[in-house]
Interface confidence: low
């Protein structure tokens, strides 16, 4: 499982690199960040390291109340600061890995960070 999470972490960070260049990747990351209320891999400062993402910008999907442009010149109090790898990883361990023992391939792939089917079973309250 540690290997799976390491793969997921690497894959998530790789897709962050693609965020400014690929709308399909961006849509997946936006969806995950908004749904899991997280931002970046380890935390929101990861976005500073992405070329062509300015230092004072995170994706709008990091905002607590998402509006167009809310991630530009963001206020730290207005965004989710927790990283997605740990947050989604915890959910995966609890709801997917333990129940389904899914293969590592289900967590990788160029376009899908975790399988759509598993994402769809995430209900947050």
């Amino acid at each position: 499982r540690d290997k799976v999470m390491s793969e997921f972490n690497n894959n998530f960070r790789q897709q962050m690199e693609n965020y400014p260049k690929n709308n399909h990747t961006a849509s997946i990351l936006d969806r995950m960040q908004a749904d899991f209320k997280c931002c970046g891999a380890a935390n929101y400062t990861d976005w500073e390291k992405i070329p062509s993402m300015s230092k004072n910008r995170v994706p709008d999907s990091c905002c607590i109340n998402v509006t167009v442009g809310c991630g530009i010149n963001f206020n730290e109090k207005a965004i989710h600061k927790e990283g997605c790898v740990e947050k989604i990883g915890g959910w995966l361990r609890k709801n997917v890995l333990e129940q389904k023992l899914i293969s590592e391939e289900d967590l990788g792939g160029e376009q899908k960070l975790i399988s759509e089917e598993d994402l769809h079973h995430h209900h947050h309250h």
Partner: antibody
């Protein structure tokens, strides 16, 4: 300002073909997904197809898969919908729609072009 | 595919009324839910995106709420220009992108 303008609609016999065009202006076209959404007269909205900003990811509704082909030309700020094997149930207004990203909904729509398939 | 169900399918109301339209998804869609208004002979117009964010230029009498599977569009004080058909749409699981069947708002 942002504008999307469809053209190419008309009356065609069942089994025939039409090519719809959508000319975009007022925004950086290559940054946006574009969708085709249709509406049969007096009915609701039905998603038909979308193409990503680079033109390399295209999806279709099951109802048109294998018959319709969507493409785009970023140099001309245009998208196209080639419709073959048209059926009576394809009769609808076809809207070209800008898609900023999944969280934001479809923020700009063209005025629509009517396709009528006669049997 | 995710099915979107709107209720009611039609309703009659008077100017000044508070009106509520609901939309239910067949599975959780987080907040990836949008509302559109369509008037006869016109293209739909985006009112609310992300379940509750007001699209630029849309009057503040329109508001949206909900998360997961249940969503609401509210018009706080109905105006004459608000009589139209309203659609919800999900963009959580795509393709396909799916719409509700529409709610026709008529003058009582």
């Amino acid at each position: 300002q942002v504008q999307l303008e469809e053209s190419g609609g008309g009356v065609v016999k069942a089994g025939g073909s039409l090519r719809l065009s959508c000319a975009a202006s007022g925004f950086t076209f290559s940054d946006y997904y574009i969708n085709w959404i249709r509406q049969a007269p007096g009915k609701g909205l039905e998603w038909v197809s979308y193409i990503n900003n680079g033109g390399y990811t295209i999806y279709y509704a099951d109802s048109v898969k294998g018959r319709f082909t969507m493409s785009r030309d970023n140099a001309k700020n245009s998208v196209y919908l080639q419709m073959n094997g048209l059926r009576a149930e394809d009769t609808a207004f076809y809207y070209c729609v800008r898609d900023p990203r999944s969280y934001y909904g479809f923020d700009y729509w063209g005025q629509g072009t009517l396709v009528t398939v006669s049997s | 595919d995710i099915q979107m169900t709107q209720s009611p399918s039609s309703l009659s109301a008077s100017v000044g009324d508070r009106v509520t339209i609901t939309c239910r998804a067949s599975q959780s869609i987080s907040r990836f839910l949008h509302w559109y208004q369509q008037k006869p002979g016109k293209a739909p117009k985006l009112l609310i995106y992300g379940a509750s964010s007001l699209q630029s230029g849309v009057p503040s009498r329109f508001s949206g709420s909900g998360s997961g599977t249940d969503f609401t569009l509210t018009i706080s004080t109905l105006q004459p220009e608000d009589f139209a058909t309203y659609y919800c749409q999900q963009s959580y699981s795509t393709p396909p992108i799916t719409f509700g069947q529409g709610t026709r708002l008529e003058i009582k």
